[in-house]
Amino acid sequence: ARNGDHCPLGPGRCCRLHTVRASLEDLGWADWVLSPREVQVTMCIGACPSQFRAANMHAQIKTSLHRLKPDTVPAPCCVPASYNPMVLIQKTDTGVSLQTYDDLLAKDCHCI
Amino acid sequence: ARNGDHCPLGPGRCCRLHTVRASLEDLGWADWVLSPREVQVTMCIGACPSQFRAANMHAQIKTSLHRLKPDTVPAPCCVPASYNPMVLIQKTDTGVSLQTYDDLLAKDCHCI
């Protein structure tokens, strides 16, 4: 159940895909990854106001209970709904290898 | 990849399963659910310090970038890793029906 995509907080303030440029040093990968030297990391950032992109029934419950007691139950959180694969060229004992990671780059976001 | 389960913030402070008691009224379900009158909602609450229960590579990246740019990249968030099903007895036009919801109660938690 993918609920409303209208952000009541204003354009770009709610849960959505963002791109953050990061070097191998930023990621702590310099010692085991050869390429790419820089990664365009796609991640899910933004607020999850009431029923915005609610992933499922659990998210809807969380919204209801957060409204009742914000200090007890946190608001839903903006997280990946799916991922894009990414290939890294890694250093190995014998040279290099290509490794595909399926859970590295967010493709789509929702609130849960 | 399920990283460390040791919480550096102290017992019970990090991402874990909590139970919150909620009535149908609390959940806004009183008009369409007959039973149960009260739900023991299991949900994931708590902090996600560095590499604690990191769900995948994306969570590890998020941790690294949050440390570098806390204003830009949020810390990983405590969300359900899996769910337990729950049966609700619902009101219908003709009487009642039993409906199983697979995404209502959190079973296990991780950080993403």
Epitope: A47, L68, K69, P70, A75 | -
Partner: antibody
Framework: QITLKESGPTLVKPTQTLTLTCTFS??????????VSWIRQPPGKGLEWLAH???????RYNPTLKSRLTITKDPSKNQVVLTMTNMDPVDTATYYC??????????WGQGTLVTVSS | DIVLTQSPSFLSASVGDRVTITCKAS??????VAWFQQKPGKSPKALIY???YRYSGVPDRFTGSGSGTEFTLTISSLQPEDFAAYFC?????????FGGGTKLEIK
């Protein structure tokens, strides 16, 4: 129409206990999402939240004052009572009660000025 | 405790002006922020809840925005009755905390 009104002594002596009553109408404190908070404001100063009681009798207190505060409710009388022990001249303030609906304090009483002096 | 830093503390403006008051939280409070107006000798009046929602009866010249740690209250065209003190408040965590207030005065 939602209204709240604070009542209690206007003058208390140091070390005494203050008891304030908030009498409200227009809503039920038995309804999910409802609560009542107490807030105070020393003359010419800002607002300080003191205590909160939820519809389900769950209570919260300001940690700096927790040992001195007690909040209770009587939904049948539409009242919330705050007691504050060991009063001191620095506790001189206008004390407000406010309705909380889903966390947000939407209706406030007119306030009652409490002076602590010997 | 979450500290709300409100700025400016004092603001002089004229009728018809557009003014903005900011409120910064020491940690993420989501959208659980309210704004209040208080006139001398009166109790606070609720203007905005959930960071951006106006209460019924509040003129649409009052606009709230923000989420996380940065929030603003904007009055688009000041009216004589708007000169008062304004407070932000967070209700995401106990203890609930208020900003120090902004006193809006006629220039």
């Amino acid at each position: 129409q939602i209204t709240l009104k604070e009542s209690g002594p206007t003058l208390v002596k140091p070390t005494q206990t203050l008891t304030l009553t908030c009498t409200f109408s227009g809503f039920s404190l038995s309804t999910s999402g409802m609560g009542v908070s107490w807030i105070r404001q020393p003359p010419g100063k800002g607002l300080e939240w003191l205590a909160h009681i939820y519809w389900d009798d769950d209570k919260r207190y300001n940690p700096t004052l927790k040992s001195r505060l007690t909040i209770t409710k009587d939904p049948s009388k539409n009242q919330v009572v705050l007691t504050m022990t060991n009063m001191d001249p620095v506790d001189t303030a206008t004390y407000y009660c406010a309705r909380s609906s889903y966390g947000a304090m939407d209706y406030w009483g007119q306030g009652t000025l409490v002076t602590v002096s010997s | 405790d979450i500290v709300l830093t409100q700025s400016p503390s004092f603001l002089s403006a004229s009728v018809g002006d557009r003014v903005t008051i900011t409120c910064k939280a020491s940690q993420n409070v989501g959208t659980n922020v309210a704004w209040f107006q208080q006139k001398p000798g009166k109790s606070p009046k609720a203007l905005i809840y959930s960071a951006s929602y106006r209460y019924s009866g509040v003129p649409d010249r009052f606009t709230g925005s923000g989420s996380g740690t940065e929030f603003t209250l904007t009055i688009s065209s000041l009216q004589p009755e708007d000169f008062a003190a304004y407070f932000c408040q967070q209700y995401n965590n106990f203890p609930y905390t208020f900003g120090g207030g902004t006193k809006l005065e006629i220039k």
